[in-house]
């Protein structure tokens, strides 16, 4: 349906409070450098002119379009050049090629300090003071670090920011309330933005159909009882409201989001039994209940797989005539079937059926030929499982830190030409796996593994992508998506590295490591294990082990000395000696 | 050496009918997929259908119904059968094998010589 | 409909020269099935490269394919005088039946 002011079609539709939040997210995502003041004040004009076609669609500018506007309010901005350079070119080209040009500038990586979370009583007095500020401060920050996270979901974030801020602030005990809870939003937020920056990656490097495929494996595994065609509705719809938010068409994508949860609770006799508890709340926490929503139970009288997709004499004639809806098929099939297989492993498995039916059909006996293309999924389902196993057992010997540190030596040897903050930060996120997986029953790990894994490794190949140094990981991450994790468990060391030089000052430390918080000292020494692994790529376990022992009694040792300057200078020395005798 | 040779065209009156034939050699037909493609002259190449090793056949929209592709293993031969042909049938008609371990893509590694197809009063 | 517009139409270029011919295509293809053909007068066509960047056996490396859904790429990094001719893109789809080429493009001699 067109409407004649897009703008004063989306106020309306989201209401005042969400628009602002979702025109201050889009302008943070696009400009991620400039200050908070200066976005709230574009935010704040977009507003007052959407208020005015409200009033009258037909008022000047009200037809134009929201790339339009949101674009000339960027574009004017002063000295944009100086701040953003080359983004600066972006505005001599018309709409559409200005979003795009804005979106291949956004910056995955942005040059900005992490974010600092205010002491709790400071927090609670500014919250106090000014909410709506306080709460468009964390949608700033947020936004502008992850300019891919899914807006309508960061405003939800925003929520519980609030309902935690305000729920903290009362008690006496502020910090003690607010440091677990914030901590859990922000784990979650976190997830949220590496899985949301696959999807943008998916859709950015394969399309939609690629992203639709997804959606149909994810839908069929939460909702078995539904109808093929209910799956392929809910999976087109997701896919344009994905398609909305990593083009940058936010208020679109929100609104459009906010349709698909009401359509889901309309019609949830055709989709779900599990949908009703969502459907009583608000519309944020709604469309978030249903994105997160368990699965349905499998229904009882499911008949093989085979009959339909092996046995049935029409299969090559129903593959070559419409391959959209027969794989599409296969994959709903399959997947309603399997919610214990990731969705990574389902699309695997429906491209090796596709293949099997490519090679097969033309041949003189077909069925002869695709026959045991079932039975031939088997390497392909055990390959994930193992890696759940022997990841989940080495995570139980070793707890968290110790995980990320198997991880980052294994990750360090197969690319050690990456940068060493981005090994660290992809090691220590690809170790959380353990805490965030391998503690859930049986039937629900290989999903949470490597669906995860797959996301951090996305993480990994975009930041690869802007400065690429290893040709295994291009090679990785230039292949089909879901073959990605598989491609990089599969790397082993690269033996064409030619190792570092041995630096002192690499492993040289002072007392502010003292009183550094638990996990920047973790990162100091992981940073160190890079390094000393880059060093000498074919060290073995024990003498890493014994190196990093080392290092550790002598920063706890130190840290405890009287004099702790005077122990990190006479004892560093001698750890460093020790540390190159022992990997000799 | 394996070739492809098609026979039967020429000169055909408006509504008439023409059955073209691809003789293969050098390989057992039976175990390839062969394609029809055609190209007017002075234009570009238009698909008109396949034979799957099995028998199968597939057709491009504008060809099914007045255009039949059959085969006979014994000959090593496979065959396109056109009827009610119109002026805008004038053609080279080529036989093209599908490359093998592909079913369904447009991927054409060996062509005969083409015959020409006159349809005219 | 399904469209597979290929560009430019001709193009003359001299002997070492890069020449670039692109092919847009309307729905995407199919899973890269994208091929490339080169055909000389009164000549049959002849497959340069499938799924979209793989290069059949015994054609010069100066071939290359790129791209994937909707857009795609035919480069000649050094024309050589056995190069002039008409190249055709050939597209699959969802159904077979669909199985379309594009318009051609003519590299002439400048």
């Known amino acids: 349906e067109a409407h004649k002011s897009e703008i004063a079609h989306r106020f309306k539709d989201l209401g005042e409070q969400h628009f602002k939040g979702l025109v201050l997210i889009a302008f943070s995502q696009y400009l991620q450098k400039c200050p908070y003041e200066e976005h709230i004040k574009l935010v704040q004009e977009v507003t007052d002119f959407a208020k005015t076609c409200v009033a009258d669609e037909n008022a000047e500018n009200c037809d134009k379009s929201i790339h339009t506007l949101f674009g000339d309010k960027l574009c004017a901005i002063p000295k944009l050049r100086d701040n953003y350079g080359e983004l600066a070119d972006c505005c001599a080209k018309q709409e559409p090629e200005r979003n795009e040009c804005f979106l291949q500038h956004k910056d995955d990586n942005p040059n900005l300090p992490p974010f600092q979370r205010p002491e709790a009583e400071a927090m609670c007095t500014s919250f106090q003071e000014n909410p709506t500020s306080f709460l468009g401060h964390y949608l700033h920050e947020v936004a502008r670090r992850h300019p891919y996270f899914y807006a309508p979901e960061l405003l939800y974030y925003a929520e519980k920011y609030n309902e935690v801020l305000t729920q903290c602030c009362t008690e006496s005990d502020k910090a003690a309330c607010l440091t677990p809870k914030l901590d859990a939003v922000k784990e979650k937020a976190l997830v949220a933005a590496v899985r949301q920056r696959m999807k943008c990656s998916s859709m950015q490097r394969f399309g939609e159909r690629a992203f639709k495929a997804w959606a149909v494996a994810r839908m069929s595994q939460r909702f078995p009882n539904a109808e093929f065609a209910e799956i392929t509705k809910l999976a087109t719809d997701v896919t344009k409201i994905n398609k909305e938010c990593c083009h940058g068409d936010l208020l679109e994508c929100a609104d459009d989001r906010a349709e698909l949860a009401k359509y889901m609770c309309e019609n949830q006799a055709t989709i779900s039994s599990k949908l009703q508890a969502c459907c009583d709340k608000p519309v944020l926490q709604k469309s978030q209940c249903l994105a997160e929503i368990e699965h349905d139970n499998i229904p009882a009288d499911l008949p093989s797989i085979a009959a339909d997709f092996v046995e049935d004499k029409e299969v090559c004639k129903n593959y070559a005539e419409a391959k959209d809806v027969f794989l599409g098929t296969f994959l709903y099939e399959y997947s309603r079937r399997h919610p214990d297989y990731s969705v990574s492993l389902l699309l695997r498995l429906a491209k090796k059926y596709e293949a099997t039916l490519e090679k097969c059909c033309a041949e003189g006996d077909p069925p002869a030929c695709y026959g045991t293309v079932l039975a031939e999924f088997q390497p392909l389902v055990e390959e994930p499982k193992n890696l759940v196993k022997t990841n989940c057992e080495l995570y139980e010997k070793l707890g968290e830190y110790g995980f990320q540190n198997a991880v980052l030596v294994r990750y360090t040897q197969k690319a050690p030409q990456v940068s060493t903050p981005t090994l660290v930060e992809a090691a220590r996120n690809l170790g959380r796996v353990g805490t965030k997986c391998c503690t859930l029953p049986e039937a629900q790990r290989l999903p949470c593994v490597e669906d995860y894994l797959s996301a951090i490794l996305n993480r990994l190949c975009v930041l690869h992508e802007k400065t690429p140094v290893s040709e295994k990981v291009t090679k990785c991450c230039s292949g089909s998506l879901v073959e990605r994790r598989p491609c990089f468990s599969a790397l082993t060391v690269d033996e064409t590295y030619v190792p570092k030089e041995f630096k002192a000052e690499t492993f040289t430390f002072h007392s502010d490591i003292c009183t550094l918080p638990d996990k920047e000292k973790q990162i100091k020494k992981q940073t160190a294990l890079a390094e000393l692994v880059k060093h000498k790529p074919k060290a073995t376990e024990d003498q890493l082990k014994t190196v990093m022992g080392d290092f550790a009694q002598f920063v706890d040792k130190c840290c405890k000395a009287a004099d702790k300057d005077n122990c990190f200078a006479t004892e560093g020395p001698n750890l460093v000696a020790r540390s190159k005798e022992a990997l000799a | 050496e394996v070739q492809l040779l098609e026979s039967g065209g020429g000169l055909v009156q408006p509504g008439g009918s023409l059955r073209l034939s691809c003789a293969v050699s050098?390989?057992?037909?039976?175990?390839?997929?062969i394609n029809w493609v055609r190209q007017a002259p002075g234009k570009g190449l238009e698909w008109i259908g396949i034979?799957?090793?099995?028998?199968?056949?597939f057709y491009a929209t504008w060809a099914k119904g007045r255009f039949t592709i059959s085969r006979d293993n014994s000959k090593n031969t496979v065959y396109l059968q056109m009827n009610s042909l119109r002026a805008e049938d004038t053609a080279v008609y080529y036989c093209?094998?599908?490359?093998?371990?592909?079913?369904?893509?447009?991927?054409?590694?060996?062509w005969g010589q083409g015959t020409l197809v006159t349809v005219s009063s | 409909d399904i469209q597979m517009t290929q560009s430019p139409s001709s193009v003359s270029a001299s002997v070492g020269d890069r020449v670039t011919i692109t092919c847009q295509s309307s729905?995407?293809?199919?899973?890269?099935?994208l091929s490339w053909y080169q055909q000389k007068p009164g000549k049959a066509p002849k497959l340069l490269i499938y799924?979209?960047?793989k290069l059949t056996s015994g054609v010069p490396s100066r071939f290359s394919g790129s791209g994937s859904g909707t857009d795609f790429t035919l480069t000649i990094s050094s024309l050589q005088p056995e190069d002039f001719a008409t190249y055709y893109c050939?597209?699959?789809?969802?159904?077979?039946?669909?199985?379309?080429f594009g318009g051609g493009t003519k590299v002439e001699i400048k």
């Open positions: 729905p995407s293809v199919w899973s890269n099935f």
């Open positions: 034979i799957w090793a099995s028998g199968t056949t």
């Open positions: 093209a094998r599908t490359v093998p371990g592909y079913s369904t893509a447009p991927y054409f590694d060996l």
């Open positions: 050098g390989i057992d037909l039976s175990n390839y997929a």
């Open positions: 799924e979209a960047s």
């Open positions: 050939g597209g699959g789809y969802s159904s077979i039946s669909d199985t379309t």
